[in-house]
């Protein structure tokens, strides 16, 4: 009763197509698969960024897999062949592992890479990234930004840099078609006459860095003697009403300050008969139903009402 063995996949490699972190893992079928012609061979693939505690595990029948990685760190992957139990009259048979690693050969001391990279997707319309130059770099250093997301056939360079003293310190992106809810990859590299500059890689999803415009048209009506209804409108732009969460800051008679979070464009407030004046501001953010994260908008303009005037309107 001979033991059934299977070879690992051949030519396992990690290929960088130039998409700034989106890599291809590819391989060829193992040698000597003739004995298992009737079998559907599967592959178990494990991969991670070096330094990560956990492996991502994929079982596939394909000869390739694609995923995003942090190119600031190395990547390691391993794969083995799986023969399902149907092929072996018993238990599943696994080959030994084939292994592959990949990293961008660095240049430049780490301090030369850009500092404090910050990207904001204003009102889900305009992406702007800004950074500070690396520590100790001279004014002859210039940084260049490249970006890619699925849908572009190659990485593109920024065409509209924000400059200070001739040095690129940010990028205004053009309209980015179908770019949300997918990984957006950025590389900022640099050049200098005096020293090599370290590249930096960043990955995020645009819907998670949206900063909306503040709400507009703040109004206030007295619903009953001790109830005031605050209302506002969603800001102009592509963000649907269902995607907003709001924070309201209410001040009664310059003393009591109430901050509360609501999910729609109204808020009913209980007041006392001592209340003379009411002021409020609102800001907006993309909610958890539309993104995993977001940035609060600026506060709206402050609106104030005399409660006595509101009461007169109500009585009329």
């Amino acid at each position: 009763d001979t033991e059934i063995k299977v070879n690992p996949p051949q030519d396992f490699e990690i290929v960088d197509p130039g998409y700034l972190g989106y890599l291809y893992l590819q391989w060829q079928p193992p040698l000597s698969l003739d004995n298992f012609k009737e079998c559907t061979v599967e592959y178990e693939l494990k991969y991670r960024n070096i330094g990560s505690e956990t492996w991502t595990t994929i079982i596939t029948k394909n000869l390739h897999y694609k995923d995003g990685f942090d190119l600031n760190k190395g990547i390691e992957a391993k794969i083995h062949t799986l023969l399902p139990w149907q092929c072996t009259n018993g238990s599943e048979v696994q080959s030994s592992w084939a292994e592959a690693t990949y990293w961008i050969s660095p240049q430049g001391i780490p301090e030369t890479k850009v500092q404090d990279m910050d990207c904001v997707y204003y009102n889900w319309q305009y992406l702007l990234c800004s950074w500070k130059p690396g520590i100790g770099v001279l004014l002859d250093t210039n940084y260049n930004l490249f970006y890619w997301y699925e849908g572009l056939d190659r990485a593109l360079q920024c065409v509209d840099y924000i400059k200070v003293d001739g040095q690129n310190i940010g990028c205004r992106f053009p309209y980015l078609e179908s770019s949300d809810y997918k990984d957006f990859y950025i590389c900022v590299n640099g050049s200098s006459e005096t020293k090599p500059i370290r590249s930096s890689y960043f990955t995020f999803q645009l819907q998670n860095i949206v900063k909306p415009l503040p709400p507009v048209c703040l109004t206030c009506t007295q619903e009953s003697l001790y109830e005031i209804k605050l209302k506002w409108s969603i800001p102009l732009g592509p963000i649907p009403a269902r995607c907003f969460v709001y924070e309201i800051e209410i001040r009664e008679d310059d003393t009591t300050l109430v901050t509360t979070t609501v999910e729609n464009e109204t808020y009913t407030l209980k007041i006392t008969n001592e209340t003379r004046q009411l002021c409020f501001v609102v800001r907006s953010k993309v909610n958890i139903y539309c993104s995993d994260d977001g940035i609060w908008s600026e506060w709206s303009d402050k609106q104030c009402w005399e409660v006595e005037e509101l009461l007169k309107k109500t009585l009329l």
Epitope: I109, P110, E111
Partner: antibody
Amino acid sequence: QVQLKESGPGLVAPSQSLSINCTVSGFSLTKYGVHWIRQSPGKGLEWLGVKWAGGSTDYNSALMSRLTISKDNNKSQVFLKMNSLQSDDSAMYYCARDHRDAMDYWGQGTSVTVSS
Amino acid sequence: QVVLTQSPAIMSASPGERVTMTCTASLSVSSTYLHWYHQKPGSSPKLWIYSTSNLASGVPARFSGSGSGTSYSLTISSMEAEDAATYYCHQYHRSPLTFGSGTKLELK
């Protein structure tokens, strides 16, 4: 397996220049950078510079005017040249492989004495 | 440049004893770029702990490293004779790259 081996003149006269070769095996200079470090009782471990895999170079600014680091990828060799040597340049000179922002393999070092 | 100050300069420990040595940086250094090297007389330095707390290949599990910002340390949970050596901290964050002056650990 990964190896680095320095070879130098041993003795150098004051004001003369120093040339040291670092011959590597077990890895490619197109994938890994190589650092030069020296060690003396007076100054401890002192980083001199690095030749990156892509061909660019970083130097210790205090020594930059006297240093040149070059390499030959095909011969798997990295070269250190230092001009105008003085007695305080006497040290053990090491080359070391750069790997993920650390120096993971070092050569055995070559001793350099500056004396007339 | 970043000056790394190691203390103590020399220390001795008995087998089984817990040993801690420190490295203080004059400027903040990212923990990713703070490493420790081990050197015995007549040998070249060996990478011992990388990125503050990761043991290099072949380093016994009794070694550990910790720290952040300007303060880092290397600890041996239970001293063994073979641990007698000089230990250097090294920062790879800012140019020029610098090393501490070393802590010489002797067997008592």
